[in-house]
C-alpha cells in the first residue's frame, strides 16, 4: 500500500443498465470446487468516498468495539487508531477489552506520504458483514500519526491484506488474513469489487452510497460478467504481477516490457491512482494527449494537480482513449488484457465553485516505486486474490461505470513470448523493503 498518492479511494454503486451486461462465459475447469457461489452476507459490505479509500466494518475486542477499516492490498499490518485524533470519531480502547494482549513491542510504518506508529498486541477480531468467525489477530494500536488519517474519510484503521514479507516491524508478525485462514476453515482466497461513483458525490450521498464488496473465502459470481482471467502472483510480498504490454486505444507503447514492471507491478486497493514508472508515464501521457487532442488541457491536469470541468452531463468521454494492460497468463507464452475506460481514469471530484459542472482529476500518475494498479484499475474489474493458487483473477465488474459505446474488458488469450523477461529483479539489500512508499 503505497502512499504516493497512495491513499484511498471512492464510492457509489453505478451498475451498467441490464441490457448492457455481458453474458457470462463459464470457466469451471479453472475454478476449485466450493470456491464459487453466493456470499450474500458479504455483498455491498464496503463503503468509501472518492479518493479516500474503501472500508469495511470490523469489530475488535471484548465486548466488541466497532470500527471502519480501510481495505488495503498494498500493506500487511492490521492497524487501528488507538488514541484521540482530530480526524477520528472513535478509536480502539484497549483498556476496555478483556481479551487484549500486549505484545510488548512498538511498530513504525512510513509511507511515501503519511506515517504512523503504535504498540503491538493481539485481540479478538470479526467482520460483521463477513464470515461468521472470530479470530485472534495481531493489531497495531496507532498512538501517533502524521498525514495518515483523512478528515471526513470515515475510517479509523487499515487492514493490510498482503503477505508477511512486508509486515512491520518484520515478517514474523502474522498478517490478519493469514491468522483468519489458519484459525478457521475459510479458504485462502478473497475477492474485491470496488465500485466507483462515476459522478461527484456530495457529502450526504457519499455517506449513504455503497462502495463495493469484499468476499472473504471465495468468489461471488453475481459480481462480474464474462470469465475470470488469472495472472500469476510473481512473489508473495505485495501482490506482485507482471505486465507484458501496454496499449493506448490499441496503440502499443512499444517499450521494453521490463520498463512496465520497474521496479515492480502491484495490485493495491489502498492506492487511488494507476501509477506508472516515470518513462512509462511519460509515454502514456504523450499517447493519451495525442488521442484526446481535439481538446487542449493544461499541463497541471496531466500532472493530476488541476481539475477539468464540463457542463453537467456533457463530459466528452469519447475523445479519451482506453488504456489496456496485458498481464502474463497462466499458460506459457499466453497473456490477457484488461482495458479501462476514461470513466475509470478520470476521477470525479466535487468543485465547490462550479457545482453545476462535472469536474475530474487525471488519475494516472508517476511513480518511482513501479506500477501500482490502484482503484482506477480495480474499479473496472472484479479482482480475485487467489492466494491458495498464487494467482490474481480479473473479470469485468458488474458495477463498473461505462457508457453506451464502450465497456471495460478482460480479453484473451494473446500469444506473448519471453514474458518472464518482463519481470525486474530487485537487487537484494537489507533495505530493499524498508520504505513502504505509497501513492
Amino acid at each position: 500500500t503505497h502512499l504516493g498518492i497512495r491513499l484511498p479511494l471512492r464510492s457509489g454503486l453505478a451498475g451498467p443498465p441490464l441490457g448492457l451486461r455481458l453474458p457470462r462465459e463459464t470457466d469451471e475447469e479453472s475454478e476449485e470446487p466450493g470456491r464459487r457461489g453466493s456470499f450474500v452476507e458479504m455483498v455491498d459490505n464496503l463503503r468509501g468516498k472518492s479518493g479516500q479509500g474503501y472500508y469495511v466494518e470490523m469489530t475488535v475486542g471484548s465486548p466488541p468495539q466497532t470500527l471502519n477499516i480501510l481495505v488495503d492490498t498494498g500493506s500487511s499490518n492490521f492497524a487501528v487508531g488507538a488514541a484521540p485524533h482530530p480526524f477520528l470519531h472513535r478509536y480502539y480502547q484497549r483498556q476496555l477489552s478483556s481479551t487484549y494482549r500486549d505484545l510488548r513491542k512498538g511498530v513504525y510504518v512510513p509511507y511515501t506520504q503519511g506515517k504512523w506508529e503504535g504498540e503491538l498486541g493481539t485481540d479478538l477480531v470479526s467482520i460483521p458483514h463477513g464470515p461468521n468467525v472470530t479470530v485472534r489477530a495481531n493489531i497495531a494500536a496507532i498512538t501517533e500519526s502524521d498525514k495518515f488519517f483523512i478528515n471526513g474519510s470515515n475510517w479509523e484503521g487499515i487492514l493490510g491484506l498482503a503477505y508477511a514479507e512486508i509486515a512491520r516491524p518484520d515478517d514474523s508478525l502474522e498478517p490478519f488474513f493469514d491468522s483468519l485462514v489458519k484459525q478457521t476453515h475459510i479458504p485462502n482466497i478473497f475477492s474485491l469489487q470496488l465500485c466507483g461513483a462515476g459522478f461527484p458525490l456530495n457529502q450526504t450521498e457519499a455517506l449513504a452510497s455503497v462502495g463495493g464488496s469484499m468476499i472473504i473465502g471465495g468468489i461471488d459470481h453475481s459480481l462480474y460478467t464474462g470469465r475470470l482471467w488469472y495472472t500469476p502472483i510473481r512473489r508473495e510480498w505485495y501482490y506482485e504481477v507482471i505486465i507484458v504490454r501496454v496499449e493506448i486505444n490499441g496503440q502499443d507503447l512499444k517499450m521494453d516490457c521490463k520498463e512496465y514492471n520497474y521496479d515492480k507491478s502491484i495490485v493495491d486497493s489502498g492506492t487511488t491512482n494507476l501509477r506508472l514508472p516515470k518513462k512509462v508515464f511519460e509515454a502514456a501521457v504523450k499517447s493519451i494527449k495525442a488521442a484526446s487532442s481535439t481538446e487542449k488541457f493544461p499541463d497541471g491536469f496531466w500532472l493530476g494537480e488541476q481539475l477539468v470541468c464540463w457542463q453537467a452531463g456533457t463530459t466528452p468521454w469519447n475523445i479519451f482513449p482506453v488504456i489496456s494492460l496485458y498481464l502474463m497468463g497462466e499458460v506459457t507464452n499466453q497473456s490477457f488484457r484488461i482495458t479501462i475506460l476514461p470513466q475509470q481514469y478520470l476521477r470525479p471530484v466535487e468543485d465547490v465553485a462550479t457545482s453545476q459542472d462535472d469536474c475530474y482529476k487525471f488519475a494516472v500518475s508517476q511513480s518511482s516505486t513501479g506500477t501500482v494498479m490502484g482503484a482506477v484499475i480495480m474499479e473496472g474489474f472484479y479482482v480475485v486474490f487467489d492466494r491458495a493458487r498464487k494467482r490474481i483473477g480479473f473479470a469485468v465488474s458488474a458495477c463498473h461505470v461505462h457508457d453506451e459505446f464502450r465497456t471495460a474488458a478482460v480479453e484473451g488469450p494473446f500469444v506473448t513470448a519471453d514474458m518472464e523477461d518482463c519481470g525486474y529483479n530487485i537487487p537484494q539489500t537489507d533495505e530493499s523493503t524498508l520504505m513502504t512508499g505509497r501513492a
Epitope: R104, V107, G118, T143, S145, D146, D170
Partner: antibody, heavy 124, light 107 residues
Framework: EVQLLESGGGLVQPGGSLRLSCAAS????????MGWVRQAPGKGLEWVSA????????YYADSVKGRFTISRDNSKNTLYLQMNSLRAEDTAVYYC?????????????????WGQGTLVTVSS | EIVLTQSPATLSLSPGERATLSCRAS??????LAWYQQKPGQAPRLLIY???NRATGIPARFSGSGSGTDFTLTISSLEPEDFAVYYC?????????FGGGTKVEIK
C-alpha cells in the same frame, strides 16, 4: 547547539513525590521525541520513560509504570517527569535525552544528546 | 524481558590496539540495537544506531555489526579518548534494556 538542562532533583522521603523538568533549546522541540534515562550510583543505565513529539506515544519501564508520568509542554520547550510513590531503588541520576525524530519507534530514531543529569535521592 | 549480556566486563588494551566488544541478546532484537559511550562524570553519547550505522560526528574507527542476537562494536585503533564504558541498548521489545556495560581501560 542542542542544550538540555535538567532540574528538580533532590532528597525526598520514600513515598514522596518529585517533578523533574528538562528545559530544551537549540532545536524545534515539538518535532522530536524526548526521554528520561536513569543511572543508580556506580551502576548501569536504565530507560525510565519516553514520549513522541506530540505526546501521543509514551513508553514506561515496568518498574515505574503507574507511579511516574511523562509529559511535555511544547509551548515552553520543556519535558517533565512526575514521580510519585518514590522508593529507595529510584535513587539515581536522571538524564533527559532528545530523540532522533518525532517518532518513538522508528528505526534510526535513537536518543542523543543527553543532558548532564539531575540527582534524585530517596531516603529517610 | 530481553536481557543484553555484554562481554567482556572489562577490556584492558593499549592505545593503537583493536577493541572488540560483544553484546548478546536473550532473543532476537532484529537490528534495533545501539551502542553508547560514557566517560566518568559525563552523560552517555550515541556511537552506533540500528546495529551498524555510525551516529553523526562519530569517527570511522568505530563500527558496529550483527543482527538478531549477536552484535559487535569494534574500535579499529584505540585513541586515548576512547577509554570509557560502552553500553549496548535494545528498543525491539518492551522494556527497552541496556547491557551491563564493558569498561575499556588502559593496559
Amino acid at each position: 547547539e542542542v542544550q538540555l538542562l535538567e532540574s528538580g532533583g533532590g532528597l525526598v522521603q520514600p513515598g514522596g513525590s518529585l517533578r523533574l523538568s528538562c528545559a530544551a533549546s537549540g532545536f524545534t522541540f515539538s518535532t522530536y521525541a524526548m526521554g528520561w534515562v536513569r543511572q543508580a550510583p556506580g551502576k548501569g543505565l536504565e530507560w525510565v520513560s519516553a514520549t513522541s513529539g506530540s505526546g501521543g506515544s509514551t513508553y514506561y519501564a515496568d518498574s515505574v509504570k503507574g507511579r511516574f508520568t511523562i509529559s511535555r509542554d511544547n509551548s515552553k520547550n520543556t519535558l517533565y517527569l512526575q514521580m510519585n510513590s518514590l522508593r529507595a531503588e529510584d535513587t539515581a541520576v536522571y538524564y533527559c535525552a532528545k530523540g532522533g525524530s518525532q517518532w518513538l519507534y522508528a528505526p534510526g530514531s535513537w536518543f542523543d544528546p543527553w543532558g548532564q543529569g539531575t540527582l534524585v535521592t530517596v531516603s529517610s | 524481558e530481553i536481557v543484553l549480556t555484554q562481554s567482556p566486563a572489562t577490556l584492558s588494551l593499549s592505545p593503537g590496539e583493536r577493541a572488540t566488544l560483544s553484546c548478546r541478546a536473550s532473543q532476537s532484537v532484529s537490528s534495533y540495537l545501539a551502542w553508547y559511550q560514557q566517560k566518568p562524570g559525563q552523560a552517555p553519547r550515541l556511537l552506533i544506531y540500528d546495529a551498524s550505522n555510525r551516529a553523526t560526528g562519530i569517527p570511522a574507527r568505530f563500527s558496529g555489526s550483527g543482527s538478531g542476537t549477536d552484535f559487535t562494536l569494534t574500535i579499529s585503533s584505540l585513541e586515548p579518548e576512547d577509554f570509557a564504558v560502552y553500553y549496548c541498548v535494545q528498543r525491539s521489545n518492551f522494556p527497552w534494556t541496556f547491557g551491563g556495560g564493558t569498561k575499556v581501560e588502559i593496559k
